[in-house]
């Protein structure tokens, strides 16, 4: 029955890029300008997304597919299909309601987006700090002090980062 019905339904023959035009006896008409239908059998076409303001066009709209947007430099996409653009910050910062703020001591952010995250606590894994953390970088954990027993090859840690107040706790 379903198959019979689909064969009798003239709209099922309308391919993507057209719509089943009720004003013209259900004939397949091409989508109006700046609109699209991405599947067959549609009774309307959808208006093309316009990438304006902080959005820029990544892919132009066509009669069969919507436009795709991304964000202008200094901003990054959020949400499904880049529904929002959020301001970039520098590495070592996070975006707050008052704008970009430096990461607090003991935290870092190595990207231009997202939040500051706490440095890794090396001692929880029984390891020692090999390289100090900064606002932009996590600490690097090295072998545990027990691993550096006499006879084992010694590891000379690099000089600590020269950022006052940023030595690991």
């Amino acid at each position: 029955f379903e198959r019979t019905r689909s064969l009798q339904d003239p709209c099922s023959n309308c391919p993507a890029g057209t719509f089943c035009d009720n004003n013209r006896n259900q004939i397949c008409s091409p989508c109006p300008p700046n609109s699209f239908s991405s599947a067959g059998g549609q009774r309307t076409c959808d208006i093309c997304r316009q990438c304006k303001g902080v959005f820029r066009t990544r892919k132009e709209c066509s009669s069969t597919s919507n436009a795709e947007c991304d964000c202008t430099p200094g901003f990054h996409c959020l949400g499904a299909g880049c529904s929002m653009c959020e301001q970039d910050c520098k590495q070592g910062q996070e975006l707050t309601k008052k704008g970009c703020k430096d990461c607090c001591f003991g935290t870092f952010n190595d990207q231009k987006r997202g939040i500051c995250r706490p440095w890794t606590n090396c001692s929880l894994d029984g390891k020692s700090v090999l390289v100090n953390g900064t606002k932009e970088r996590d600490v690097v954990c090295g072998p545990s002090p027990a691993d550096l027993s006499p006879g084992a090859s010694s590891v000379t840690p690099p000089a600590p980062a020269r950022e006052p107040g940023h030595s690991p706790q």
Partner: nanobody
Framework: EVQLVESGGGLVQAGASLTLSCVIS????????MGWYRQAPGKERAFVGT???????IYSDSVKGRFTISTDDGKNTMYLQMNNLKPEDTAVYYC????????????????????WGKGTLVTVSS
């Protein structure tokens, strides 16, 4: 006044090829899309293919791979190249052109104006 005139129809054997032409004339006519349709004896008019507002070319499943739509903008002409014709392709073939009133391309406007030719008959014998 806008006029569309089809030509090129005729009687051919199955498996043969045929090219239809559609010439558009008329003052200040700006179409956003043009299409080919056909009406077989005793049936409703059916979609064959169209050139869309962004110059995509779309075909019905029944002719895909066999028929090709093209245009010659300098001559205001659209063509339908039909290869490997089958008896079920027998129909009167119409061309159509679509425009939007007042050139309103900014809003989704279903108040479309369509213009149709009088058709040309294609008969495919087995």
């Amino acid at each position: 006044e806008v006029q569309l005139v089809e030509s090129g129809g005729g009687l051919v054997q199955a498996g043969a090829s045929l090219t239809l032409s559609c010439v558009i004339s008329g003052r200040t006519f700006s179409s956003y899309a043009m299409g080919w349709y056909r009406q077989a004896p005793g049936k409703e008019r059916a979609f064959v293919g169209t050139i869309t507002w962004n110059n995509d070319i779309i075909y019905s499943d029944s002719v895909k791979g066999r028929f090709t739509i093209s245009t010659d903008d300098g001559k205001n002409t659209m063509y339908l190249q039909m290869n490997n014709l089958k008896p079920e392709d027998t129909a009167v073939y119409y061309c159509a052109a679509y425009s939007v009133p007042y050139g309103d391309f900014c809003t989704l406007n279903y108040d479309l104006m369509d213009y149709w030719g009088k058709g040309t008959l294609v008969t495919v014998s087995s």
